[in-house]
C-alpha cells in the first residue's frame, strides 16, 4: 500500500501563518480572514522511523506540490530547505531521512525534530514575515511550538 | 474499565450556543487523540471533530468547520465541544468517542447526550 | 472524499445463518477499514479494523476481509444478539466517512 498522507496546515505558538515566500522558501506571518487563503496547505505522510505515543515519523510535503521540507548541512549547519522531487518516486514509506520529521507532542505543544539531526527543530522568528529555519535551541527567543489543523482532502 | 460520560445536550433554537462536555476515566486520558461523533435522529454516523492526546492538533469537516470548536483538559479528564451557530440539521445525539486521525478508528465510545436545534 | 456504500441496507436471516454485509469505497482505501456494531439504543462498537483485525474482546464468528475497494463484514453463525445496525468506515483521507449502515433482524 502507499503510505498514509494527510493535509494539514502549521501555525506558530504565535499564530502566526506559513506561506510561500519564493519558490523554495517558507516565511510566517500573522493572517486573517481571507489572506488565510495564502496559507500553505501540507501533505503530511506518516513514514517509517521510530514510533511512541507522543513521537510519530512524518514527512512534510507541499499539497500537489513536489517539494518536501529537508534538512541538510550547509556550511557545517543544520538547514532546512524545500527540495524538489520525482512525484513518481514520492511520498513513500520508507523516506530518506533528510525528509523525515519527528513529530512530538506533548502537553498542548507540538514541534518538529529533524530525524537528521536530533535536537534540531522547524523554528520561526518572533519577528514577522521572517524565513522558516531549522533552530538548534529551544525555550529561547525562537519559536519551535506549533498548532496543526487538518483539512479536508 | 472504560468510561466516557456525555452531558449537555439540549433543546435550543437556531443559531444559538451549546457546549458539551465528555468526562473520560478508566485510561489515561491525556495519552489518547479523541472526537466527536453524531447520529442524526434514525440517521447514520457523521464524525464532527478531533482533537490530538495533547491538544495541539484539530480537525472538523466542512459541514461544521467555522461553528464547533474542540478543546480538552487533560488535567480534568474531560473533552469538550463548542456548537456556535447551531443550525436545525445539527439535531443529533453527539457521541464523545477515543480515536481520531492518526489511529483512524473509534475503539470507546460514550452513550451519547442529545441536541435538538428547534424553533 | 471517499464515499462509502453498504448493501444491503437492511436483511433478514435466522439464527445460525451466514451472513455478509459488503462495503464498496469510491476509490482504494488500502485496507482503512473498520466495521462497527451498534444495537438499538446504544453507542456504536468496534468490531473489526485495518479491514480483518478483530478488536479486543469480539467473538471470532465476526470476520473482515478484502482490498482495494470492495470489503465484506461476515458473521459465520448469527446469534440473537447480533440484531444490530453495522457501519463501515474508511480512514485513509480525510475526511474518513462512515457507510449509510445495515440493519439485521432474525427472521
Known amino acids: 500500500a502507499p503510505v498514509r498522507s494527510l493535509n494539514c496546515t502549521l501555525r506558530d505558538s504565535q499564530q502566526k501563518s506559513l506561506v510561500m515566500s519564493g519558490p523554495y522558501e517558507l516565511k510566517a506571518l500573522h493572517l486573517q480572514g481571507q489572506d488565510m487563503e495564502q496559507q500553505v496547505v501540507f501533505s503530511m505522510s506518516f513514514v517509517q522511523g521510530e514510533e511512541s505515543n507522543d513521537k510519530i515519523p512524518v514527512a512534510l510535503g507541499l499539497k500537489e506540490k513536489n517539494l518536501y521540507l529537508s534538512c541538510v548541512l550547509k556550511d557545517d549547519k543544520p538547514t532546512l530547505q524545500l527540495e524538489s522531487v520525482d512525484p513518481k518516486n514520492y511520498p513513500k514509506k520508507k523516506m530518506e531521512k533528510r525528509f523525515v520529521f519527528n513529530k512530538i507532542e506533548i502537553n498542548n505543544k507540538l514541534e518538529f525534530e529533524s530525524a537528521q539531526f536530533p535536537n534540531w527543530y522547524i523554528s520561526t522568528s518572533q519577528a514577522e514575515n521572517m524565513p522558516v529555519f531549522l533552530g538548534g535551541t529551544k525555550g529561547g527567543q525562537d519559536i519551535t511550538d506549533f498548532t496543526m489543523q487538518f483539512v479536508s482532502s | 474499565e472504560v468510561q466516557l460520560v456525555e452531558s449537555g445536550g439540549d433543546v435550543v433554537q437556531p443559531g444559538r450556543s451549546l457546549r458539551l462536555s465528555c468526562s473520560a476515566s478508566?485510561?489515561?486520558?491525556?495519552?489518547?487523540?479523541m472526537s466527536w461523533v453524531r447520529q442524526a435522529p434514525g440517521k447514520g454516523l457523521e464524525w464532527v471533530a478531533y482533537?490530538?492526546?495533547?491538544?495541539?492538533?484539530?480537525y472538523y469537516p466542512d459541514t461544521v468547520k467555522g461553528r464547533f470548536t474542540i478543546s480538552r483538559d487533560n488535567s480534568k479528564n474531560t473533552l469538550f465541544l463548542q456548537m456556535d451557530s447551531l443550525r436545525p440539521e445539527d439535531t443529533a445525539v453527539y457521541y464523545c468517542?477515543?480515536?481520531?486521525?492518526?489511529?483512524?478508528?473509534?475503539?470507546?465510545w460514550g452513550q451519547g447526550t442529545l441536541v435538538t436545534v428547534s424553533s | 472524499g471517499i464515499q462509502m456504500t453498504q448493501s444491503p441496507s437492511s436483511l433478514s436471516a435466522s439464527v445460525g445463518d451466514r451472513v455478509t454485509i459488503t462495503c464498496r469505497a469510491s476509490?482504494?482505501?488500502?485496507?482503512?477499514l473498520t466495521w462497527y456494531q451498534q444495537t438499538p439504543g446504544k453507542a456504536p462498537k468496534l468490531l473489526i479494523y485495518?479491514?480483518?483485525t478483530l478488536a479486543e474482546g469480539v467473538p471470532s464468528r465476526f470476520s473482515g476481509s478484502g482490498s482495494g475497494t470492495d470489503y465484506t463484514f461476515t458473521i459465520s453463525s448469527l446469534q440473537p444478539e447480533d440484531i444490530a445496525t453495522y457501519y463501515c468506515?474508511?480512514?485513509?483521507?480525510?475526511?474518513?466517512?462512515f457507510g449509510q449502515g445495515t440493519k439485521l433482524q432474525i427472521t
Open positions: 468517542a477515543r480515536g481520531g486521525v492518526y489511529k483512524g478508528y473509534f475503539d470507546e
Open positions: 478508566g485510561f489515561i486520558f491525556s495519552k489518547y487523540d
Open positions: 485495518n479491514a480483518k
Open positions: 468506515q474508511h480512514f485513509w483521507t480525510l475526511p474518513y466517512t
Open positions: 476509490g482504494n482505501i488500502y485496507d482503512y
Open positions: 482533537i490530538s492526546h495533547g491538544g495541539a492538533g484539530t
